[in-house]
C-alpha cells in the first residue's frame, strides 16, 4: 500500500471576520494508526488548533464524522473568525507512539486571511478654535481592518482635499491594521456651516465606504464687527446710541457700555439673529440723559467674544443743542478694562 499523503487542497482561504472558516484536509490512507492534529504555524512555536485524540476545542468542529473508520476527510471548521486567527494552518498526521506521538506527515499548509471591516472613522478637530484665514488640522482614525490595503479621502463640503498625510500601522505583517490621517484646512468666514468628511474604502465594505464627519463650527471662531451709531430722539435731553455687533460665531458674547471710561451697563447676548452663513448679529442700545452731562461724552461699546480679548468701538456724543445729531467714532481693538479711560491700552 502506498505511503500516506496529507492533502490540503487550498493554498489560501479568505474569510470575513465573524464567519466560519473551513480548512480542508484529506488523507490517502488509514495507515499508520495515530491521531490527526491541526496547527497554526510551523516549528517549535506552533499552536495546537485541534487534536483528534484529546482536548476541548470549542470553536472547532470536524466537517466529517471522524469516528467512521473509512473516513479520510479531516477537514475542520473554525467558528467566529477574528483577525487574530490569521495564519498558516497545517494538517498533520501522527503515528501512535510513546512517550509522545510521532509526527508522520504534514500537509503543505493553508493560509487563512481574515477580512475585517475598519471601525467607523472618528474625525476630531483642533482643541482650540481658530479664525478665518488660519489653517486648522483635522484627524481621522479607524482601526481593526484587514487586509492592509485601504483608501482614505478627505472632503470639505463635497470638495476633495489634497493637503493631508496618512499612515497605516503597523508597517509589517499584522493580524489587523489602523489608519491615521491628518488634513489641513484653511478656514473661511463662511465655514460655520461647513463639514469635513473622512471617507474610507476597503475591500470588506463592498463599495460602500465608511464616513466620519466633523463640523467646522466646532473649529472656527468668527470675531464680531462693531458699529456704534446714534439714533434720532424726539426728546431733546436724551440720546439713543446703539452698538451693532455683526457676523460673530460662536454665540458666547458679553457687551459692556462705558461712559467716559466708566462702566455704565454689562449685558450678555441673548436673543440673537442668525445669518444665513451661520454667524450671529446682536444689537444693544444705551439711552443717555444729556442733561446729566456738562461736557461731551465718549460712549464705548466693549465686546468680549468667546473668551477672547475684548474689542471696542467708541462714539463721541457732543452735548450741544445744535449738534445732537453729530459725533465722531473711534475704534479700539485693545483689551480695554471695563473702567479704563478712552485710549487706554491693553
Amino acid at each position: 500500500e502506498d505511503e500516506l499523503q496529507v492533502i490540503q487542497p487550498e493554498k489560501s482561504v479568505s474569510v470575513a471576520a465573524g464567519e466560519s472558516a473551513t480548512l480542508r484536509c484529506a488523507m490517502t490512507s488509514l495507515i499508520p494508526v495515530g491521531p490527526i492534529m491541526w496547527f497554526r504555524g510551523a516549528g517549535a512555536g506552533r499552536e495546537l488548533i485541534y487534536n483528534q485524540k484529546e482536548g476541548h476545542f470549542p470553536r472547532v468542529t470536524t466537517v466529517s464524522e471522524l469516528t467512521k473508520r473509512n473516513n479520510l476527510d479531516f477537514s475542520i471548521s473554525i467558528s467566529n473568525i477574528t483577525p487574530a486567527d490569521a495564519g498558516t494552518y497545517y494538517c498533520v498526521k501522527f503515528r501512535k507512539g510513546s512517550p509522545d506521538d510521532v509526527e508522520f506527515k504534514s500537509g503543505a499548509g493553508t493560509e487563512l486571511s481574515v477580512r475585517a471591516k475598519p471601525s467607523a472613522p472618528v474625525v476630531s478637530g483642533p482643541a482650540v478654535r481658530a479664525t478665518p484665514e488660519h489653517t486648522v488640522s483635522f484627524t481621522c482614525e479607524s482601526h481593526g481592518f484587514s487586509p492592509r490595503d485601504i483608501t482614505l479621502k478627505w472632503f470639505k463640503n463635497g470638495n476633495e482635499l489634497s493637503d493631508f498625510q496618512t499612515n497605516v500601522d503597523p508597517a509589517g505583517d499584522s493580524v489587523s491594521y489602523s489608519i491615521h490621517s491628518t488634513a489641513r484646512v484653511v478656514l473661511t468666514r463662511g465655514d460655520v456651516h461647513s463639514q469635513v468628511i473622512c471617507e474610507i474604502a476597503h475591500i470588506t465594505l463592498q463599495g460602500d465606504p465608511l464616513r466620519g464627519t466633523a463640523n467646522l463650527s466646532e473649529a472656527i471662531r468668527v470675531p464680531p464687527t462693531l458699529e456704534v451709531t446714534q439714533q434720532p430722539m424726539r426728546a431733546e435731553n436724551q440720546a439713543n446710541v446703539t452698538c451693532q455687533v455683526s457676523n460673530f460665531y460662536p454665540r458666547g458674547l458679553q457687551l459692556t457700555w462705558l461712559e467716559n471710561g466708566n462702566v455704565s451697563r454689562t449685558e450678555t447676548a441673548s436673543t440673537l439673529i442668525e445669518n444665513k452663513d451661520g454667524t450671529y448679529n446682536w444689537m444693544s442700545w444705551l439711552l443717555v440723559n444729556t442733561c446729566a452731562h456738562r461736557d461731551d461724552v465718549v460712549l464705548t461699546c466693549q465686546v468680549e467674544h468667546d473668551g477672547q480679548q475684548a474689542v471696542s468701538k467708541s462714539y463721541a456724543l457732543e452735548i450741544s443743542a445744535h449738534q445732537k445729531e453729530h459725533g465722531s467714532d473711534i475704534t479700539h481693538e485693545a483689551a480695554l478694562a471695563p473702567t479704563a479711560p478712552l485710549g487706554g491700552s491693553g
Epitope: E1, L30, I31, V33, G34, P35, I36, Q52, K53, E54, L66, T67, K68, R69, N70, N71, K96, G97, S98, P99, D100, D101
Partner: antibody
Framework: EVQLVESGGGLVQPGGSLRLSCAAS????????MHWVRQAPGKGLEWVSA???????YYTGSVKGRFTISRENAKNSLYLQMNSLRAEDTAVYYC????????????WGQGTMVTVSS | DIQMTQSPSSLSASVGDRVTITCRAS??????AAWFQQKPGKAPKSLIY???SLHSGVPSKFSGSGSGTDFTLTISSLQPEDFATYYC?????????FGQGTKLEIK
Amino acid sequence: EVQLVESGGGLVQPGGSLRLSCAASGFTLSSYDMHWVRQAPGKGLEWVSAIGTAGDTYYTGSVKGRFTISRENAKNSLYLQMNSLRAEDTAVYYCVRGGVWDDAFDIWGQGTMVTVSS
Amino acid sequence: DIQMTQSPSSLSASVGDRVTITCRASQGINNYAAWFQQKPGKAPKSLIYTASSLHSGVPSKFSGSGSGTDFTLTISSLQPEDFATYYCQQYVSYPYTFGQGTKLEIK
C-alpha cells in the same frame, strides 16, 4: 447494529488444531484493525493477535508460529487458525474491533470457549 | 513487553462510595491506556480510551486520568451494577498488555 459473533470453539486434544471465526455486521471489517483476546478460566485478559487494515499481522510471544490471524473481506469475517494447541491455550477467545484512529478496543464479541485437553 | 500493574487486586466498597483504581505501566505509554469492565460470564465492556475519553454510552460517573506511566479509573458513586472486575490496558505498542484486574466487591 455493530456486532461481532465468534464461533468455532470446542474441545480439542493437545497438538490439535482449531479455526475460530468472527462474523462482523454493521461495519466493514477490513476498515478496522481487528484483534483476538483470550481469557483463561478464572484468569485475566490476554491479548493474542491482531491484523491491520493493510493485512499486517501481530502475535503475542506464546502463540507465534502456531497461530495465524486472517480475514475474508467478502464474508466480512475474521479468523484465527490455531495449530499445535496446548493446555495453556484453554480460554474464552474474544474477537475485538480496534478503534477508528488509535486502535483502542471498542466492540467485543460474546466469546467462544476453546478447551485443550486429552 | 510493557507490564501493566494494577492495584488493588480486590476492593470492597459500599453503594454510593467513590472508588479509585490505579494502573502503572513499566514504561511510558503516552496516554494510550484503556479501561474495561467485566462481569462474570460476560464479555468485557470498553469504558475509557486514551486515558480519559469515555466510550459512547458509558455513564459520566466513570472517569479516567493519567499520562506516561500512572493512570487511574474513578467511579464517583457506586451503584449495584458497578460491582465487577476492572482491567487496564496499554495499546501504544504490540504486544498489547492488560493489568491483572481489580475485583470490586460489595462490602
